[in-house]
Interface confidence: low
């Protein structure tokens, strides 16, 4: 709030801009007829130092010269980089109640001379772009510093443009606004940057370049792909490029991929044949360009072209499995199952499957197409049957996969031994086995098959299976494995014309069942009691039930109950006990046990045997 220095003046020696570490002398002088009174000796001049509008020091003790009542000179040292404000005030000593009156002020800037600009780099984006250069300015000067960019080329032509740096903006890039055209391709250009401020000036080393050095081509545009004869693996990528481009880099990848396929193409002229594409796959394509084989810079990548390759006929072999069920003495039901091809094998949208069942000797053939991944037929029990399935898309069909229909569990000598199922974690089970001991024929492969042991699972849900080579004796099953569910697991050993199997139950995680079995009836037959029950509902089993326990005790007894443990079998829902006394009333109940523990007890039933005691 200095009122245009009406009372006096403030001057700085050597200058209001000084190098870091220098001292300055600040003189404050009153104008004639200005002051406190007619007694000059009562005029006291003081100097206040402000940084960022905050008073930081009264320089009363730094006076180096004093003309009493008229002027004072103060020496200031150790000024920090940047701007410092000094304000001179008049303090009338005979009037203590009045505050000092501002006389005038001055700003002193402390900084450094500019360093020579370094690392000059120039680019022209596209053949029709303009030249823009950037550089490293070096240390901050803390002063307003002007930069001049100067370009000299052929025909004695020089152009220049300026910008400045201060505490609000930085100047380390300039667009000259001129275009270097391809007809100047062989010419050399020299560029330099000069920096000037109040403390000095400096100039960069000259930087020499040619058109090819600095022109970064525009990214290719109008990218499209033409699939030759609607091929899914071969296509011609086409694009538009600037006229001088001699080298292109292509990158492409399926959309779900994490690594690019890279190709360099010389003199492609906006066209390149790709031969290794995956049919029926969403791809992303990008192209970059360069104007010179050895020198110059690559353009930015083009915008992505995203497109899907056409279909091709499926490849690969379907994984087939089957179930056999005898219907009566001369008919059997064959249910064929197969797994969908993975996308790289399907190579398109699978429209249907061609299924064939053939009786080898009589040459009877049943054929059908289905859109499902299973097929069921009733066929005679006699004869040797073989099945084949192939997958078809709009371009053709895969080679048929054949499987011989044998009695899967018909040959005891082929049954694998010591089958075990161990839970590995929440969603898989490790199945291990030993090979059949006395197989008549060599095992061609093992099939591990599993199905949730829930009501109707055989009819409602297809089986899950894994094919295992004959020299492997273990399988980690994980497909559709959920915790707290019991699975029936079968290991089949298959030879050319026979099959043997062993079965086990397993779960990936278990808890004690939620409830015990419900006793539905107690009947007395031939001096034995038969306990009948209903199984625990499937969701409450919480894993594979290992056994049931039947407990009993006399009605009012406080003694520990007796118990009978029964190996769990799905088909069994009654069991005899024979150690109860006649004409004694007993209380009976049941529990179920998994590997995790025992369930709470089921319902209690009272019963008084009438028969003779054992």
């Amino acid at each position: 709030n200095i009122d245009v220095c009406k009372l006096g003046t403030v001057t700085v020696q050597p200058a209001p801009v000084i190098p870091l570490g220098s001292a300055a002398n600040i003189s404050c002088s009153l104008n004639p007829k200005q002051g406190c009174s007619h007694y000059p000796s009562s005029n006291e001049l003081i100097l206040l130092k402000f940084v960022n509008d905050v008073l930081v020091e009264n320089l009363h003790g730094k006076k180096v010269h004093d003309h009493t009542g008229h002027s004072s000179t103060f020496q200031v040292t150790n000024l920090s980089l940047g701007m410092t404000l000094f304000v001179c005030k008049l303090n009338c000593s005979n009037s203590q109640k009045k505050p000092p009156v501002p006389v005038c002020g001055v700003e002193i800037s402390v900084g450094v001379a500019p360093e020579p600009p370094q690392n000059i780099s120039c680019v022209q984006e596209g053949e029709n772009g303009t030249v823009a250069c950037s550089w490293n300015s070096g240390k901050v000067t803390y002063l307003k510093t002007n930069y001049t960019l100067q370009l000299s080329g052929p025909n004695n032509l020089t152009c220049q443009k300026q910008c400045f740096s201060d505490n609000r903006q930085n100047c380390n890039r300039l667009d000259l606004g001129i275009n270097l055209s391809p007809d100047l391709a062989e010419s050399r250009f020299i560029v330099r940057v000069t920096a000037i401020n109040d403390l000095g000036n400096s100039s960069s080393l000259p930087h020499t370049f040619t058109f090819l050095d600095i022109v970064i081509p525009l990214p290719p545009w109008d990218i499209r792909i033409n699939f030759l004869n609607a091929s899914g693996s071969r296509g011609t990528l086409q694009w538009e490029d600037e006229g001088q481009v001699v080298l292109n880099q292509l990158r492409y990848q399926p959309l779900n991929s994490t690594s690019w396929n890279m190709v360099n193409a010389t003199n492609a002229k906006g066209k390149y044949d790709l031969r290794d594409l995956r049919p029926f796959t969403e791809y992303e394509f990008q192209i970059s360009s360069k104007l010179h084989l050895s020198g110059g810079s690559w353009s930015n990548w083009s915008e992505s072209l995203r497109t899907r390759t056409p279909e091709e006929e499926p490849v690969g072999i379907l994984d087939i499995w089957y179930m056999k069920q005898d219907i009566d003495y001369d008919r059997q039901q064959i249910s064929l199952f197969w797994k969908s091809l993975n996308p790289s094998e399907a190579r398109g949208k699978i429209l249907h499957y061609q299924v064939t069942l053939q009786e080898v000797t009589k040459k009877t053939t049943l054929q059908n197409t289905t859109r499902h991944t299973s097929w069921t037929r009733v066929i005679p029990r006699t004869g040797a049957w073989t099945a084949s399935v192939s997958a078809a898309n709009s371009k053709g069909a895969s080679a048929p996969t054949h499987i011989n229909i044998v009695d899967l569990c018909g040959t005891g000598l082929l049954a694998p031994h010591q089958v075990s199922a161990k839970s590995e974690n929440m969603d898989n089970i490790l199945v291990t086995w030993q090979p059949p001991k006395k197989a008549d024929s060599a095992v061609r492969e093992y099939i591990v098959e599993w199905r949730a042991l829930q009501p109707g699972s055989i009819t409602k849900f297809p089986p899950h299976w894994l094919r295992i080579p004959p020299d492997n004796m273990s399988a980690l099953i994980s497909e559709n494995i959920k915790p707290y569910i019991c699975y029936e697991i079968r290991v089949h050993a298959l030879s050319e014309s026979q099959g043997g199997c062993s079965s086990i139950r397993g779960d990936s995680k278990h808890k004690a069942p939620v409830s015990g079995p419900h006793i539905t009836a107690i009947t007395e037959k031939k001096e034995r009691l038969f306990i009948s029950w209903t199984h625990i509902p499937f969701p409450e089993q919480r894993g594979c039930i290992l056994h049931y326990r039947i407990y009993w005790k006399e009605r009012d007894s406080t003694a520990q109950p007796e118990l009978c443990e029964i190996q769990y079998r799905r088909s069994q829902n009654s069991h005899p006990i024979s150690s109860l006394q006649p004409r004694v009333t007993y209380v009976l109940w049941m529990t179920a046990v998994t590997a995790a523990g025992e369930s709470p007890q089921g319902n209690e039933r009272e019963f008084c045997p009438q028969g003779k005691a054992n």
Epitope: W221, D222, I223, R224, I225, N226, F227, A230, E282, L305, R306, T307, R308, P310
Partner: nanobody
């Protein structure tokens, strides 16, 4: 021999609707770019709407018709349609069906007449006020 045959044009009152059809014969264009262009008397043929032919079959429209025109096709029938609603007098023109023998994704190329290899004879649409 490849033929594109437009139909469905006619005289309609402003605010009315039309459904133009383009039936292709002699070649399957289901995977390739197709478009509708129009030409009013004394003006150049201009792009109206197009289908890219790439996976997902992207539709393109000129801003002047966006929201009123809908382009679609049935690959199995080798037919393309242009549903025109809320017709205006400035929609009066001969409407041409065009087909390419390649996929086109870039907006600029879809609009270009040179992108398309085959053209129909056109169907007249007249909108009276």
């Amino acid at each position: 021999q490849v033929q594109l045959q437009e139909s469905g044009g006619g005289l309609v009152q402003a605010g009315g609707s039309l459904r133009l059809s383009c039936a292709a014969s002699g070649r399957t264009f289901s995977n390739y770019a197709m478009a509708w262009f129009r030409q009013a008397p004394g003006t150049e043929r201009e792009f109206v709407a197009g289908l890219s032919g790439s996976g997902g079959d992207t539709a393109f429209y000129d801003n002047s018709v966006m929201g009123r025109f809908t382009i679609s096709r049935d690959s199995a029938k080798n037919t393309m349609w242009l549903q025109i609603n809320n017709l205006k007098p400035e929609d009066t023109a001969v409407y041409y069906c065009a087909a390419a023998t390649h996929v086109v994704v870039n907006y600029g190329l879809v609009r270009r007449r040179g992108t398309y290899d085959y053209w129909g004879q056109g169907t007249q649409v007249t909108v009276s006020s």
